[in-house]
């Protein structure tokens, strides 16, 4: 009779995480008498997975009844597979011996590969805000996937980005992998409502990629533009001076009026109007009584936006000239009403 062969018919078994793996093994003969054991790995450091003779292996079940005398099917099932179970499994026949059984013949091995889904991509932007025309970096990370093959794309408002670098770690064989990508994005003044999306496609996702997003509203700072204008009011000796603060983001803004360099009043932007692009407008005004002034008055609107150095715009109020002839007749927005009489 031919010598016993241990047949492992599958070079590979591919299983999704959480599922059950079936590792097939048959023997071609009942002789010699002795148990079968399953190991992960080969050599002295191999790990015992199942021993027909003894031991407790809660995740392992046998496909056939190994207690039957004529059984030659030694296939096993391993439940609740995780990426850590990946490796090469050997079905090994032992010959009954005294005091210990002796290894007789091993199968060729079956490589268990585990498909594991990537975690939801996490996108993070720069720690500090940046202004339009600046380039900022976004990172995207996803972990725990297998196999290694993965595709990552970046989008800004649905348009694919090309300036990014991606690494999948580790470089060599591993039970699971991580991906890290850094994309460079040039900010524009219209980006308050913009989104940056990191999209990850993997064989486990069956064509339904995972997405992580970052809102550029968390990243962008649009500095305001200032315009100081003067309009006459009903009383001949009063002038309304307005400071229009336009197109700023975020809302955090403090305005200070200076008269000839001296602080007159400080206020915080509260009732703002929002533009379509997500930026804000705000207006502050002073009611100036010019009759008490012999000299010209230099009015300065100074704005500190989002903790940045202050920007300012000045306006010279000519006391000698007729107030009705001065300034541009800009329509005031009723977003604030602040009076200041100069005596």
């Amino acid at each position: 009779e031919e010598e016993l062969q241990v047949i492992q018919p599958d070079k590979s078994v591919l299983v999704a995480a959480g599922e059950t793996a079936t590792l097939r093994c048959t023997a071609t003969s009942l002789i010699p008498v002795g148990p079968i054991q399953w190991f992960r790995g080969a050599g002295p450091g191999r790990e015992l997975i199942y021993n027909q003779k003894e031991g407790h292996f809660p995740r392992v079940t046998t496909v056939s009844d190994l207690t039957k005398r004529n059984n030659m099917d030694f296939s096993i099932r391993i439940g609740n597979i995780t990426p850590a179970d990946a490796g090469t499994y050997y079905c090994v026949k032992f010959r009954k011996g005294s005091p210990d059984d002796v290894e007789f013949k091993s199968g060729a091995g079956t490589e268990l590969s585990v498909r594991a889904k990537p975690s939801a991509p996490v996108v993070s932007g720069p720690a500090a805000r940046a202004t339009p025309q600046h380039t900022v970096s976004f990172t995207c990370e996803s972990h725990g996937f297998s196999p290694r093959d993965i595709t990552l794309k970046w989008f800004k408002n649905g348009n694919e980005l090309s300036d990014f670098q991606t690494n999948v770690d580790p470089v060599g064989e591993s039970v699971s992998y991580s991906i890290h990508s850094t994309a460079k994005v040039v900010l524009t003044r219209e980006d308050v409502h913009s989104q940056v999306i990191c999209e990850v496609a993997h064989v486990t996702l069956q064509g339904d990629p995972l997405r992580g997003t970052a809102n550029l509203s968390e990243t962008i700072r649009v500095p305001p533009t200032l315009e100081v204008t003067q309009q006459p009011v009903r009383a001949e000796n009063q002038v309304n001076v307005t400071c229009q603060v336009r197109k700023f983001y975020p809302q955090r803004l403090q305005l200070t009026w200076l008269e000839n360099g001296n602080v007159s009043r400080t206020e915080t932007a509260s009732t703002v109007t929002e533009n379509k692009d997500g930026t804000y407008n705000w207006m502050s005004w002073l009611l100036v009584n010019v009759s008490a002034h012999r000299d010209d008055v230099k009015l300065t609107c100074q704005v500190e936006h989002d903790g940045q150095p202050a920007v300012s715009k000045s306006h010279d109020l000519k006391v000698s000239a007729h107030p009705k002839e001065q300034g541009s007749n800009t329509a005031a927005e009723n977003t604030g009403s602040n009076e200041r009489n100069i005596y």
Epitope: Q5, I7, Q8, P9, D10, K11, S12, L14, G87, T88, G107, A108, G109, T110, E111, S113, P147, R148, D149, E173, V203
Partner: antibody
């Protein structure tokens, strides 16, 4: 479309070595076991070697055991066969073949010719 | 090693006739048998797997049957493009994977 393109064949003397490559495209390479099958001039098909998804398990025909080495690089979607100590009887067209789930071959390359001659 | 024996070595038939090809295994291979077609200068093409399942894109005039040790490939109503060499292959029994010696179907 699945494509397998072999390269690296040529004329060598007995005892010399060669490395064959098979570039795969149109499918997830790391999801398939792969094999090399050869066909001598005017002869039938002979399976040479096979490899598991990640290269942990390799199978060889007795006729090439110890002389040929199969390997793969999943990052490059490429299968390799190193041929050492070549003999005249190794002269054949070497086909790269994709294995389906039960080790039959559902896609084949066009082959690369290896000629061992003194 | 499982040996596959194909017969006949050559089959001479006319277009429209039915070809019956045989493949016998030296051991029980259950239903783990595939059939391939090879035309001159071309790579083999999978026709049948698991003894009787047609591969994608294979016309239904090709059919496979059998299990254990005796298998048959039948080509009904031969077309001109069917004249080729046909090989059987056993699998699912570990290494080595083996092929039969082939049957040439030629025009009579």
């Amino acid at each position: 479309d699945v494509q397998l393109v072999e390269s690296g064949g040529g004329v060598v003397r007995p005892g010399e070595s060669l490395r064959l490559s098979c570039a795969a495209s149109g499918f997830t390479f790391s999801d398939h076991d792969m094999s090399w099958v050869r066909q001598g001039p005017g002869e039938g098909l002979e399976w040479v070697a096979g490899i598991s998804l990640r290269g942990g398990v390799t199978w060889y025909a007795d006729s090439v055991k110890g002389r040929f080495t199969i390997s793969r690089d999943n990052s490059k979607n490429t299968l390799y066969l190193r041929l050492f100590s070549l003999r005249t009887e190794d002269t054949a067209i070497y086909y790269c073949a994709r294995e389906s789930w039960n080790t039959f071959f559902d896609y084949w390359g066009l082959g690369t010719l290896v000629t061992v001659s003194s | 090693e499982i040996v596959l024996t194909q017969s006949p070595g050559t089959l001479s038939l006319s277009p429209g006739e039915t070809a019956t090809l045989s493949c016998r295994a030296s051991q029980n291979v259950r239903s783990n048998l595939a059939w391939y077609q090879q035309k001159p200068g071309q790579a083999p093409r999978l026709l049948i797997y698991d003894a009787s399942s047609r591969a994608t894109g294979i016309p239904d005039r090709f059919s496979g049957s059998g299990s254990g040790t005796d298998f048959t490939l039948t080509i009904s109503s031969l077309q001109s493009e069917d004249f080729a060499v046909y090989y059987c292959q056993q699998y699912g029994n570990g290494p080595p994977l083996t092929f039969g010696g082939g049957t040439k179907v030629e025009i009579k």
